[in-house]
Amino acid sequence: MMTGTIETTGNISAEKGGSIILQCHLSSTTAQVTQVNWEQQDQLLAICNADLGWHISPSFKDRVAPGPGLGLTLQSLTVNDTGEYFCIYHTYPDGTYTGRIFLEVLESSVAEHGARFQIP
């Protein structure tokens, strides 16, 4: 039975050219996290494997940095980075938990962080 929940950085606005940290946290479960995948739409951005460490997809190496923790840092943001991001926690014995973050990259200098929220 899957009892865990994923808390994310929620819905984020950020400035074009800036950087942002995407964070997810799995709680309310004793399951072991074996791997976390970060995806943008249908593209794999990065993998953090409990044994092998981080792997950043080659096409994102220049703009994606691992961490902090199991999070991901996106740099040199463009308007095209607007969209959904997913943290996919592979755990044992629970299975897979998925969190969602929606990022809006703004042309203007007005950018605020959204409130944190939970996804069951």
Epitope: N11, Q41, D42, T82, G83, E84, F86, R100, F102
Partner: nanobody
Framework: QVQLVESGGGVVQPGRSLRLSCAAS????????MGWFRQAPGKERESVAA????????YYADSVKGRFTISRDNSKNTLYLQMNSLRAEDTAVYYC??????????????????WGQGTLVTVSS
Amino acid sequence: QVQLVESGGGVVQPGRSLRLSCAASGGSFSSYPMGWFRQAPGKERESVAAISSDLRFTYYADSVKGRFTISRDNSKNTLYLQMNSLRAEDTAVYYCAARESGVGYYSRAQWYDYWGQGTLVTVSS
């Protein structure tokens, strides 16, 4: 309880166009992120397009970019999918889906709360 009813499907020749509609009732349509999904015979359901409740954000699967357009009319509680330059591989049952609330679009089926019964689109010469 939200009800979604799709219409507009049918048989069409390759290269032609169709417009699907999804009429919603029983809820606050203007606050719902919405999406279109499709399932071809023997294949898994896949995402086609999605739109935010405020119309600011849209998503398209790579296979339909430049050919399909998602839109909505919140005053009519209706979601649309304009499909141009149809191909044989677009043949599928098309479903609309709604989510109670949320920011931006939702491209993945797991996030949706309500589904229509589907409308069949057949592209054949």
